[in-house]
Amino acid sequence: MKVLQEPTCVSDYMSISTCEWKMNGPTNCSTELRLLYQLVFLLSEAHTCIPENNGGAGCVCHLLMDDVVSADNYTLDLWAGQQLLWKGSFKPSEHVKPRAPGNLTVHTNVSDTLLLTWSNPYPPDNYLYNHLTYAVNIWSENDPADFRIYNVTYLEPSLRIAASTLKSGISYRARVRAWAQCYNTTWSEWSPSTKWHNSYREPFEQ
């Protein structure tokens, strides 16, 4: 049993880091493998992650972490029984994939304005709370070409757009994702989408 693709990990910079790797053949990850991880710090304890299958030869493990900060560094040991298959390290702050924003809501009761709001996925005491920027994707269910992205570079988790920038009388969907420049993160996953019917009074044309 050998590791074909070494583990690569990403952290949500809050409580979970996800590591993925590939073996050289079909593997029952949860019964044959264990990923041990330990913070390089005074008094830290070793923890064991039981991987799950991710395709025939792929494995994925969700590492639970407390109080993740930029100084943290973890040692990783991948074991098959008594055999050490791979040894490495992982610094969560250098491989951040933010959590997806939640509670996306479209407020259509403001005259001729659409207000989209969502929730910051981090608590106020987390460093990323004040450092997220967002991308909002709006698309038409009727017209695949009617697809647009709005970049929200301010901190407030909201976006106002004129209803008239979208077609009237048809249904739209929106979703939002986040990233943080400070840690050069990847984009988060998209939030669940929300749907609304866009209707507004078009100005009378002469």
Partner: antibody
Amino acid sequence: QVQLVQSGAEVKKPGASVKVSCKASGYAFTSYYMHWARQAPGQGLEWMGIINPSGGSTSYAQKFQGRVTMTRDTSTSTVYMELSSLRSEDTAVYYCARGKWWLYDWGKGTLVTVSS
Amino acid sequence: QSVLTQPPSVSAAPGQKVTISCSGGSSNIGNSYVSWYQQLPGTAPKLLIYDNNKRPSGIPDRFSGSKSGTSATLAITGLQTGDEADYYCGTWDTSTVLTPIFGTGTKLTVL
């Protein structure tokens, strides 16, 4: 919000022991390390040791080895620092502080006076 | 005896800028992360800067930290009378057992 509530001031005689408590609230107690530091009157901060509330393991500054004991009670989210063989130089304000590489939150401090 | 050296005192007028230095060595500041703590008279220390230059929520951007080699600096702009306090740098000594250490402390007087 996070609160670290420490026990009240103590007056002890040389050679005695003192046990200071620090009750935590407003966060997951076992998820954060707890440090102890002290500050003698008019002096700077001095680190004493650290406890991992999850397993109860400890590490102490070399200066206090053999004289200090840190424990925790997860049922009450409280950590304790006991210092024995007290001498006049141990007169100080003793602080508990939550954190790992840096100390996010501090208790208000407990004044321990050692006097014959 | 702290191995992190700070000036005993600094002073400046309201509205001015002041810097406080923290000098260490390769086994501490040079190899670890620096934090800064503010201790107002009669109160417990409070985290001001961590990870060399980051501010906890609620700390105004008048406070900033930097690190270069084996020394670190705390800068305070737009000084206010409420900033009058003792300031301590902190880091980890990695020479033997990993141990937190504090600087000697600096008394800031707002004139």
